[in-house]
Structures are given as C-alpha cells and as structure tokens.
C-alpha cells in the first residue's frame, strides 16, 4: 500500500547467556502466517477463480456485440479491467505465502501491484462514464438519439483508460524492491523515503479522485435518475435500478478499507504502533478491494436469473441478454429495457 507492509517474526534472542534480545540464528524464525494474511489468501484464491472465469465469459459475450451495442462496450471495458487485475493474483498470492518475500524482480514489483490501482481508476472512470450515459439517456434523450453512438463510447473508454494510466504513474514510480539483511528476504513496496509530503499527496489524490469525488458525483447522478424514473415509472422494473445501485455501492464498500488505511498510513510515522497495526492488515485490505474484480459477473448472473427466470437459459445467453440489450429512447422521456444497463460500475485494486 503506502509502505513496506510485510511482516515476519522478530530476530528473537542470542543463544549467548551474556547477551539478551539481540538476534536469533538464521533458521530459528517462525514460519506461521498471520491471520489477516491467511484471510487475504483465501479471498485472493476465490477472486482469482471467479474473476478470471467470470470476466473471461463477460469479455467473450460482449466482444461480439461491442461494435454495435453501447452497453456491451461499457461492460467489455469493465471486464477487461477486472480480468487484467486478476492475472496478477497468483504472483501476489505466492508472495504472501512466502511471508511477502518477492522473488520476481524489480520490474514485476513496479507493474503487478500497480495493476489493481490501474483497475481502480479505470473502473471508477468507466463507472462515471456509464453513469453519465445513464444520466443523458434519462435527461437528454433527444441528444442521445442524435449523438450517442459506438464511436463516442469507445472514445470515452479510451479517455478513461488514459486517465487511469496517468493516475497510476505515481504509485508505479515509487514502487521499489528492498532486500532485508536478516532473515534474507526481498520485499516489494512503496518507498517515499523522507518525502512524507509527497506520500500524503499521492494518498490524498487517490482518496479524492478514486473514491470521494466519484462517490459524490455518482450519488448525485443516481439520486436524480432514481427520482426521475420513479416519478415517471419509466423503467421496466425498479429491480434494474436496485442492481445498478448495488454495483456502485459494492465498489465503494470494497474499496473503503484500502482507502482509509492508506490515508491513515500516509499521515503516520512508520514506527508508530498504529502504522504497524495497519501494516499487518494491508494484505487483507488489498484482497478486500480485489473482490471488485469478481463481483460484477456475479451481479450480472444474479440479475439475469432474476429477470430471465431461474437459469432457464445457458449462462452465455443469460449474460448476453443482460449485457448487450440496448437502451431505448422514446419521445422526450427514456426508459431502460436492459435490467443491468447501469450495472457496470465497479473497479478492482491490488
């Protein structure tokens, strides 16, 4: 996260009677993993299995429709972001199993843990784009009839990805490997050295742009959409909106621990007891944020079952129905025929 967050046992004691509490012989350190790390490993394993399979399926379903269906473009991009993040999980898993030892080199240290942040920014920016699309469909249906096209959707996605890359750069640049003297171990983490102000700046920017600002704008956006749709009964089902809200809400719920601990750690001294406690929870917070990488396909399937009947259709066709059905604009007011049109609002982080 914001510091070197790896925990191993203490040196312990010298064997010599004249010298207490110095260091243990090299092989006398404990091999037990901490409870937060064990929980993180369980979450990583589940997220990897569900995330890779689920997002691969979503990509497969939406890729064919993405040329002509705008909703498919949104869901395709979200699934790609999630899928990419999931690919880093085996490496992160291996590192935690080895007490956060990082045998994969400096380049991997810079790139792989940054994937989750790229995913976070890409997802939240895509969610914002999708929300803007939802908003325009409801409040500017005529404009949508004239200008809302696949080309514009792809441009919006490209801008979202570009901005996400830009916002990930600071964390990427400050990631380094550190080799500990005893016990011999290589660690991968973020090191700002003496520059505490810069560390705080990065944490604040991440909190504001990746969490607080999107939370505020999406809340306002969906409040207006909900008020409009409920007042006009313009949707096929209020369930659609509930699903959309669930997707957006889950993004913020799963990112909350990571963001809170991150901002706290940036304001604490690395040797302070609170910092050290938060450090122990870092892997768990990261794994919790990673749930975002597999939750979307689950929501799509649950939503699809709800609307299509209990798995009467095959999974791909069920997903296709949910993800690629286009929104219909009628006269001056609009309604969404797709259950989960706006459901694509999620991000993932490492």
């Amino acid at each position: 996260m914001n510091s070197f967050n790896y925990t191993t046992p203490d040196y312990g004691h010298y064997d010599d009677k004249d010298t207490l509490d110095l260091n243990t012989p090299v092989d006398k350190t404990s091999n037990t993993l901490r409870v937060p790390d064990i929980l993180a490993l369980v979450i990583f394993a589940v997220v990897f299995l569900v995330g890779v399979l689920g997002n691969a399926l979503v990509v497969w379903v939406t890729a064919f429709e993405a040329k002509r269906t705008i909703n498919a473009i949104w869901f395709l991009n979200l699934a790609v972001a999630d899928f990419l993040s999931c690919l880093a999980l085996p490496i992160l898993f291996t590192s935690i199993v080895q007490h956060h030892h990082w045998p994969f080199g400096g380049a991997a240290c810079s790139i792989l843990p940054s994937l989750i942040l790229l995913n976070m920014y890409a997802s939240i920016l895509l969610l914002a784009t999708i929300s803007a699309d939802r908003f325009l469909l409801v409040f500017k249906p005529i404009w949508c009839q004239n200008f809302r096209g696949a080309g514009l959707a792809w441009i919006a996605c490209a801008v979202a990805w570009g901005l996400a890359l830009l916002l990930t750069i600071p964390s990427f640049l400050y990631r380094v490997v550190r080799e500990e003297y005893f016990p011999p171990k290589v660690l991968c983490g973020v090191d700002y050295s003496h520059d505490k102000r810069r560390e705080r700046a990065v944490a604040i920017v991440r909190l504001v742009l990746g969490f607080l600002w999107p939370l505020l704008t999406l809340t306002i956006c969906y409040t207006f959409i909900l008020l409009r749709t409920w007042s006009r009964r313009a949707t096929r089902s209020t369930k659609t909106l509930k699903v959309v809200v669930a997707v957006v809400a889950s993004f913020f719920i799963f990112w909350l621990p990571y963001q809170v601990t991150g901002i706290m750690m940036s304001f604490l001294e690395p040797s302070s007891p609170t910092f050290l406690l938060l450090n122990k929870l870092d892997s768990l917070c990261v794994s919790f944020a990673y749930i975002n990488c597999c939750i979307n396909p689950i929501i799509y399937v649950v939503a699809g079952q709800g609307f299509q009947g209990r798995l009467r259709k095959s999974l791909p066709s069920l997903l296709r129905n949910v993800l690629t059905e286009e929104s219909v604009v009628r006269e001056s007011k609009s309604f969404t025929r797709s259950t989960v049109d706006t459901m694509a609002q999620k991000t993932q982080a490492v």
Partner: antibody, heavy 116, light 112 residues
Framework: QVQLQQSGPELVKPGDSVKMSCKAS????????MDWVKQSHGKSLEWIGY????????KYNQKFKGKAALTVDKSSTTAYMELHSLTFEDSAVYYC?????????WGQGTLVTVSA | DVVMTQTPLSLPVSLGDQASISCRSS???????????LHWYVQKPGQSPKLLIY???NRFSGVPDRFSGSGSGTDFTLKISRVEAEDLGVYFC?????????FGAGTKLELK
C-alpha cells in the same frame, strides 16, 4: 565466550590476490552469518558481505562483487575472504564479525597493505 | 543503498558534559519484523569497533547506562549523559535492516 581470531598482516603487490582467515569459537558456527567489513585508513566502515555456513550462501555488497570471495571451512569453524586483483585502494584493515543482526563480536582485524 | 548521515563529524567536549550524536538514514529502517535495526558502535584507536547500542535503544551487555539511544523511522540519536575519558573515540551508526549493511561516516568524540 564468543571469539573471532583473524590471520596476521599481509603485504602484497598490485594485481596479486590475498586470502585471510577468521577462526570462530564460543558459539554454533553454522547458526550465524559471518560478515566482513573493510576500514580504509582514517575512514569509515564498509560492509563487504556475509557467508552463511549452514547453507553455503553468500551475499555481497555490489561494490565488492568480483573483488572479494567468501568461503568457510565448517570442520575447523573458520571463515575465509580472498581479495583479487589488488590495487592501492584495497589497502585497509579487514574485519570479520559475527552477523545475523548487530555486529556484537569482531575479530582484531587483518591489515592488508598493497605496495609496489 | 541506504545512506547514513552522521552529524557532527567532530564533537569536542569537556569531561562531564553531555554529548549528542545524530544519525539520519536515507530511507526508513523499519524492518518487516516491525523492529528498527539501527545500531551504534564505538572504535578507539588501534582497536576493533565495539557494539554499544542495538535496535535503536538497547544497551549491549557491559555498556554503562550513561549511554542511551533514541529515534525512529529515519532519525536517530546517541546521547552520553556525562562524558568520561574512556568514552573518547569514533562513534559510528549503522543499519542492518537492508542489504547492503551501511555505516555512518563516524563522529570523533574528543576533548576540547
């Protein structure tokens, strides 16, 4: 008690090699790193690297890779350091010290003088 | 590499004075075990260095209680409450958190 006894001073020519020893006693030799430290005349201390007798692993300061070679003889609980292609800059006192933590026990040092 | 910056390089004192030596590291010395492996050594002319303080503030066996160490993260201090003649020498701070192990340039404690 822990003791580290180093070999005597060496006078060598530029380009030559030198091998010094460090005899350890008073502790389980294979349980701890054996570290080596260089101190040039009137200067600070520089860590050369360590050798871990238990698994035969060595770790070097990047600066001394190719210059120093660390070995041990477990049967005699003796650590060795060989310095290659000596130059005038290699003239210094070389200490062995028991590692795996703070360097609580040091040898008396081996003075290496490189002179034409 | 972790750079250890020691100040002052020379510290003239009178016997009985308090002496304070500062050491700053270029990056955090907090180890993954949550300990900070910052140590202090003293070296007297013609002798090997001797361990004084280990892990920031722990006195090595036989070290008088007039020696104390403090600090955290990147900033550390060695204090000698009342300097005695036998305390004169060169004091080094060192970190063994990361490879390579590094030492400060040394502070020469001498009489005024």
């Amino acid at each position: 008690q822990v003791q580290l006894q180093q070999s005597g001073p060496e006078l060598v020519k530029p380009g030559d090699s030198v091998k010094m020893s460090c005899k350890a006693s008073g502790y389980t030799f294979t349980d701890y790193y054996m570290d080596w430290v260089k101190q040039s005349h009137g200067k600070s201390l520089e860590w050369i690297g360590y050798f871990y007798p238990n698994n035969g692993g060595a770790k070097y300061n990047q600066k001394f890779k190719g210059k120093a070679a660390l070995t041990v003889d477990k049967s005699s609980t003796t650590a060795y350091m060989e310095l290659h292609s000596l130059t005038f800059e290699d003239s210094a006192v070389y200490y062995c010290t028991r590692g795996s933590g703070p360097f609580a026990y040091w040898g008396q040092g081996t003075l290496v003088t490189v002179s034409a | 590499d972790v750079v250890m910056t020691q100040t002052p390089l020379s510290l003239p004192v009178s016997l009985g004075d308090q002496a304070s030596i500062s050491c700053r590291s270029s990056q955090s010395l907090v180890h993954s075990s949550e300990n900070t492996y910052l140590h202090w050594y003293v070296q007297k002319p013609g002798q090997s260095p001797k361990l004084l303080i280990y892990k920031v503030s722990n006195r090595f066996s036989g070290v008088p209680d007039r020696f104390s160490g403090s600090g955290s993260g990147t900033d550390f201090t060695l204090k000698i409450s009342r300097v005695e003649a036998e305390d004169l020498g060169v004091y080094f701070c060192s970190q063994s958190t990361l490879v390579p192990v590094t030492f400060g340039a040394g502070t020469k404690l001498e009489l005024k």
